[in-house]
């Protein structure tokens, strides 16, 4: 059973995994950021199902690409260089979901744009830390 | 039909530097990411970097970061690439391409004929 | 950066005949997302520019013939040339597209027995 320390530690992760996803979805919607238009062009994956901390697999495989996507946005719109971002939240995604477990993600059919990526996984974080209080 | 046609063959001395240029016709040079690539028959292909010609965005391979600076200038639907402090390692041809589709950053798709640049003395 | 090695570094054929040309990468180019591997294979004859023949490791680029096909998944892909043609002599490139730097095999010199 997790004791109070661990699901404080997971719950801290999840806050620190919520505010990296929310410092990128600002940068991106920043009414100076010329490149939206360009970004939401780009295609990424959901997951069927994301209620789970093993869900985290799904965005842990579409961090890769979300790399890509963010090496588009003037850097000045985010604080770290998008390899430092993605690796902060690749460390994160690691530690949350656990290497233990081989959990096999399965897709939804339909495509994201990078706002509704974005907003998926900041709606799972919101979700499990509000369980986890 | 989309065409990049670049500019010709260029003589240059170890340490000068030089500019070569790319320009887009068929579609709208800010649509797309141009990428430029490196040829020497010895060392095959490598990639330099890309530009984004709507704001001038540019991402270089680490190798390339001192040596290519790449711009754009929307208004003659064209990109430039300026090689600096030019050694013999240099001479090579060098292609502009563009990305196929903007629903990723690659692959190439579209290829200018190429620039062959020789440094010698 | 993924490294790509390609394999053979020439390659002596006839015409008519089948030819195999490999590519490994050190990480898998599989985007589980859509199940596409973004890997892709050039041709580059002597005094040309590259020319895209294969993207995503099996889908032909319009207007390639389809003697070239490309497959494979992962970390280890092939290109398969059936029916060699003259004009097929070149070199050819594989090309991981994934991840910034893109990065190119080797190169493979395709030549006449």
């Known amino acids: 059973a997790p004791t109070s320390s661990s699901t404080k530690k997971t719950q801290l992760q999840l806050e620190h995994l919520l505010l990296d996803l929310q410092m990128i979805l600002n940068g991106i919607n920043n009414y100076k950021n010329p490149k939206l238009t360009r970004m939401l062009t780009f295609k990424f994956y959901m997951p069927k199902k994301a209620t789970e901390l093993k869900h985290l697999q799904c965005l842990e495989e579409e961090l890769k690409p979300l790399e890509e996507v963010l090496n588009l946005a003037q850097s000045k719109n985010f604080h770290l260089r998008p390899r430092d971002l993605i690796s902060n939240i690749n460390v994160i995604v690691l530690e949350l979901k656990g290497s233990e477990t081989t959990f096999m993600c399965e897709y939804a059919d339909e495509t994201a744009t990078i706002v509704e990526f974005l907003n998926r996984w900041i709606t799972f974080c919101q979700s499990i830390i509000s369980t986890l209080t | 039909e989309i065409q990049l046609q670049q500019s010709g063959p260029e003589l240059r001395r170890p340490g000068s530097s030089v500019k070569l240029s790319c320009k887009a016709s068929g579609y709208n040079i800010t649509d797309y990411l141009i990428h430029w690539v490196r040829h020497r028959p010895e060392h095959g292909l490598e990639w330099i970097g890309w530009i984004d010609p709507e704001d001038g965005e540019t991402r270089y391979a680490q190798k390339f970061q001192s040596k290519a600076t790449l711009t754009a200038d929307t208004s003659s639907n064209a990109a430039y690439m300026q090689l600096s402090s030019l050694t013999p390692e240099d001479t090579a041809t060098y292609f502009c391409?563009?990305?196929?589709?903007?629903?990723?950053?690659?692959?190439?798709?579209?290829w200018g004929q190429g620039t062959l640049v020789t440094v010698s003395s | 950066d993924i490294v790509m090695t390609q394999s053979p570094f020439s390659l002596a054929v006839s015409e008519g005949e089948m030819v195999t040309i490999n590519c490994k990468s050190s990480q898998s180019l599989l985007r589980s997302g859509n199940q596409k591997n973004y890997l892709a294979w050039y041709q580059q004859k002597p005094g040309q520019s590259p020319k895209l023949l294969i993207y995503y490791a099996s889908t032909g680029q319009s207007g390639v013939p389809d003697r070239f096909i490309g497959s494979g998944s992962g970390t280890d892909f092939t290109l398969t040339i059936s029916d060699v043609q003259a004009e097929d002599l070149a070199d050819y490139y594989c090309?991981?597209?994934?991840?910034?730097?893109?990065?190119f095999g080797a190169g493979t010199k395709l030549e006449l027995k």
């Open positions: 391409a563009r990305q196929l589709d903007s629903t990723y950053i690659y692959p190439f798709a579209y």
């Open positions: 090309l991981q597209h994934y991840i910034t730097p893109p990065t």
